[in-house]
């Protein structure tokens, strides 16, 4: 049987005077007269930390050789052996428990040097802000490791806005109202003590706690000026009218600070747009629609200012949306002169006789944009490529300088174009350009004539193409009617119209003879009008060698 007792040793003490701290003994030594030796294994002897204990193999005494540290090894479990001469166990190995008793040799240590937290201003009393934390290496659940927290200092120091639960490290708001606009942050110095928080001269660890006060929208934006004025020039667009300077005590740059404008009245016409400059918190009023001074001399409107963020419940009832009046004067800009229409049409006819030269065919009056009355202006021709007209420099009357000609190369689709410039007599000088479209009525003063009155064809050619033209326009031109005049007699038999197109015919020779013919045509336009002189086609039929053109006719030429 074994003889032993559990052992408890205090850390941090010189334990030599307590040696032997334990002794194992087997009574088999006496009973059987055996030579027994003792041996210990375990932490402190055969396992690290080595050299804590030594034993006497003959007596079984166990001595401690060094000061113990509970925080390093809180418990030693040794195994004792009783061995015979051969080294065999004579007893069942014995467990020896050595408990290391704690002393308060560790102070609390904060888990962070700086703790950071935040809480909204106006938070209710006893709102949990954050939790701080320290640890103590001494034995848990003892006074040695029981931590007590304390606020050492608070900056700003007064009033006391936070309290610290000494046991949990939780920081709460007090009944003092937090106001970010007064103090936007607080710095606390905290300490942690053990041993129930008694103040001793042992060193004490401290930490910093930084608490940021979060903004809420508890301030109403205020406009700098109660009366605002602006000025815009008429006919301008996308110009700044005025800036509304807003002051708001809430956090700069936040939605609680940022002004939000709405039109209260006066912008039903949609002339203005307002947006906030996020840098300056000014409301920028922009004119987005042209204003005519002659219609509106003033544009007064009002705006309401709030914040982008909703108001905090603490001020919601206090906010009264008060319209801010803005008076905008419209500045008259000299608009000078204008043509009521930049293009006018005048109708003339080719049938005008010589007496029509110098006749007034129209005018192109410029008007004053501001008054709407006829303007004092000087009228100048800008473009009149064939000098058809003259313009009275003062009255703008347009006179014919030459008779209209529908067939003129300057007439396009029946229209002759003139450009006239009006220059204001008043200052500032303004030049405007107008276009006069002179629409020329065509008369049937041209008859159809042959385009190619002299032609040569090869004797083996099936047909000859005969084409006419008439300089008149529709309906005084094509389609034409063609007929071969039977002069001399028999000619109409010899030359037959095989096919008729709008302005041409295919002519066929009934008997293929070489030589020259003079074929007379009667060609009438769409109105039945033909030239007084007959249209004669001089046609030479000749022999062509291998496509090389006419060989000199071997026969006498003949007519008809």
């Amino acid at each position: 049987a074994w003889i032993t007792a559990p052992v408890a040793l205090r850390e941090g003490e010189d334990l030599s005077k307590k040696n032997p701290i334990a002794k194992i003994h087997s009574d088999l030594a006496e009973e059987r007269g055996l030579k027994i030796t003792y041996k210990y294994t375990g932490k402190g002897i055969t396992e690290p930390p080595f050299g804590i204990f030594v034993f006497n193999k003959d007596t079984g005494e166990l001595n401690v050789t060094s000061i113990l540290d509970r925080e390093e090894t809180p418990f030693f479990l040794l195994t004792g052996y009783a061995l015979d001469a051969r080294g065999n166990n004579v007893e069942k190995p014995l467990e020896l428990r050595i408990k290391v008793l704690d002393i308060n040799d560790n102070e609390p240590v904060f888990t962070q040097d700086v703790f950071v937290g935040s809480v909204e201003e106006l938070s209710a009393a006893h709102t949990l802000v954050m939790k701080i934390n320290a640890t103590d290496a001494d034995e848990p659940n003892t006074l040695n490791s029981k931590i007590s927290y304390r606020i050492v200092s608070l900056e700003p120091a007064y009033p006391p806005v936070f309290y610290l639960n000494k046991d949990t490290g939780e920081i709460y708001t007090t009944s003092v109202t937090l106001d970010r606009e007064e103090h936007s942050s607080y710095t606390l110095t905290v300490e942690a003590r053990d041993g129930n928080g008694e103040v001793t001269d042992k060193p004490v660890k401290q930490a910093q706690v930084q608490i940021r006060i979060l903004d809420v929208n508890d301030n109403i934006p205020v406009v700098e000026n109660k009366v605002l004025e602006g000025m815009v020039e008429e006919n301008q667009v996308n110009v700044e009218v005025t800036r509304i300077k807003v002051f708001d005590a809430d956090e700069i740059g936040s939605d609680n600070w940022l002004a939000n404008f709405t039109f209260a009245s006066g912008n039903e016409g949609g002339y203005f747009h307002i947006e906030t400059d996020a840098q300056t918190n000014e409301g920028i009023v922009t004119l987005i629609k042209e204003v005519d001074y002659e219609e509106m001399k003033n544009l007064d409107f009002s705006v309401i200012v709030a914040n982008k963020a909703a108001f905090h419940k603490s001020i919601r009832s206090k906010y009264k949306p008060t319209p801010i009046p803005i008076k905008v004067k419209v500045k008259n800009v000299k608009e000078g002169i204008h043509f009521k229409s930049s293009v006018i049409s005048i109708y003339v006819s080719e049938s005008m006789d010589r007496s029509s030269k110098g006749q007034i065919i129209g005018n192109f009056q410029a008007f004053d944009e501001d008054t709407g009355l006829p303007a004092h202006a000087r009228y100048v021709k800008l473009e009149d490529r064939d000098n058809w007209i003259s313009v009275d420099s003062v009255t703008s009357e347009i006179k014919l300088a030459k008779l209209p000609d529908f067939e003129s190369r300057y007439v396009q689709n029946g229209t002759y174009t003139v450009k006239i410039v009006a220059i204001s007599e008043d200052y500032p000088r303004k030049t405007i350009t107008g276009t006069v479209l002179i629409n020329v009525e065509d008369i049937n003063d041209n008859c159809p004539t042959l385009i190619e009155p002299v032609q040569t064809i090869c004797h083996d050619a099936e047909y000859v193409n005969v084409t006419a033209e008439d300089l008149d326009g529709h309906p005084n031109s094509g389609p034409f009617s063609f007929s071969v005049i039977d002069k001399p007699p028999g000619m109409a038999e010899k030359w037959k119209i095989a096919r008729q197109e709008s302005t041409s015919v295919l002519l066929q020779q009934s008997e293929k003879k070489l030589g020259r013919s003079e074929i007379q045509f009667l060609i009438s336009d769409n109105q039945g009008f033909s030239c007084p002189e007959k249209q004669v086609l001089t046609l030479t039929v000749c022999e062509c060698l291998h496509g090389s053109g006419c060989r000199e006719a071997q026969h006498d030429s003949y007519v008809g």
């Epitope: 420099s393 220059i423 000088r429």
Partner: antibody, heavy 118, light 106 residues
Framework: QVKLQESGPELVRPGESVKISCKGS????????MHWVKQSPAKTLEWLGV????????NYNQKFKGKATLTVDKSSSTAYMELARLTSEDSAIYYC???????????WGQGTSVTVSS | DIVMTQSPAIMSASPGEKVTMTCSAS?????MYWYQQKPGSSPRLLIY???NLASGVPVRFSGSGSGTSYSLTISRMEAEDAATYYC?????????FGAGTKLELK
């Protein structure tokens, strides 16, 4: 008193451009139009164009379209004429002239001599 | 373009003598302007709207005409009148000038 002060003489190479200035003083610069006239060595006068300063619109002689460009800087009361792609034909004295009452060219600058030579 | 033809190209007159020079337009014009230019100087407005004297112009100068035919007259020639005289129209763009009449002192 009304004065039109033109920039100094220019000697330029063929193919280059030149910008002549004409500073108006003694009157409301923006109220009037400014004309530009070329006087060739043969002493003939040719109209190049006009700019209505207040309204910033221009009219050019077709012959000089693409050759002359008229601009204005209202803040400095200065009218400009730029001549592009110069040739020896462009060597001349160039005048700016104010368009006054009755549409007459009532005040003229002292002229800027432009010589195009390689 | 309206072509302005001045005649004579060169003329001379004695002090006190009456001087007349003409300007003919290729198309009818409403008004005529006359300018005087002395060597080394810029042109100077003499007459606007055919017959009106510009500010500071002596009354011995006068202008007349209509349609295509216009003239400038100096009732009594003075030494300081020796210069080149240009007519100019502005009834049609571009503005055009005559080639000038050079008036010399005899």
């Amino acid at each position: 008193q009304v004065k039109l002060q033109e920039s100094g003489p220019e000697l330029v190479r063929p193919g280059e451009s030149v910008k002549i200035s004409c500073k108006g003083s003694g009157y409301t610069f923006t109220d009037y139009a400014m004309h530009w006239v070329k006087q060739s060595p043969a002493k003939t006068l040719e109209w190049l164009g006009v700019i209505s300063i207040y309204y910033d619109n221009t009219n050019y002689n077709q012959k000089f379209k693409g050759k002359a460009t008229l601009t204005v800087d209202k803040s400095s009361s200065t009218a400009y004429m730029e001549l592009a792609r110069l040739t020896s034909e462009d060597s001349a004295i160039y005048y700016c002239a104010r368009e006054g009452d009755y549409f007459a060219l009532d005040y003229w600058g002292q002229g800027t001599s432009v010589t195009v030579s390689s | 373009d309206i072509v302005m033809t001045q005649s004579p190209a060169i003329m001379s007159a004695s002090p006190g003598e009456k001087v007349t020079m003409t300007c003919s337009a290729s198309s009818s014009v409403s008004y005529m302007y006359w300018y005087q230019q002395k060597p080394g100087s810029s042109p100077r407005l003499l007459i606007y709207d055919t017959s009106n004297l510009a500010s500071g112009v002596p009354v011995r100068f006068s202008g007349s005409g209509s349609g295509t035919s216009y003239s400038l007259t100096i009732s009594r020639m003075e030494a300081e009148d020796a210069a080149t005289y240009y007519c100019q129209q502005w009834s049609s763009f571009p503005l055009t000038f005559g080639a000038g009449t050079k008036l010399e002192l005899k």
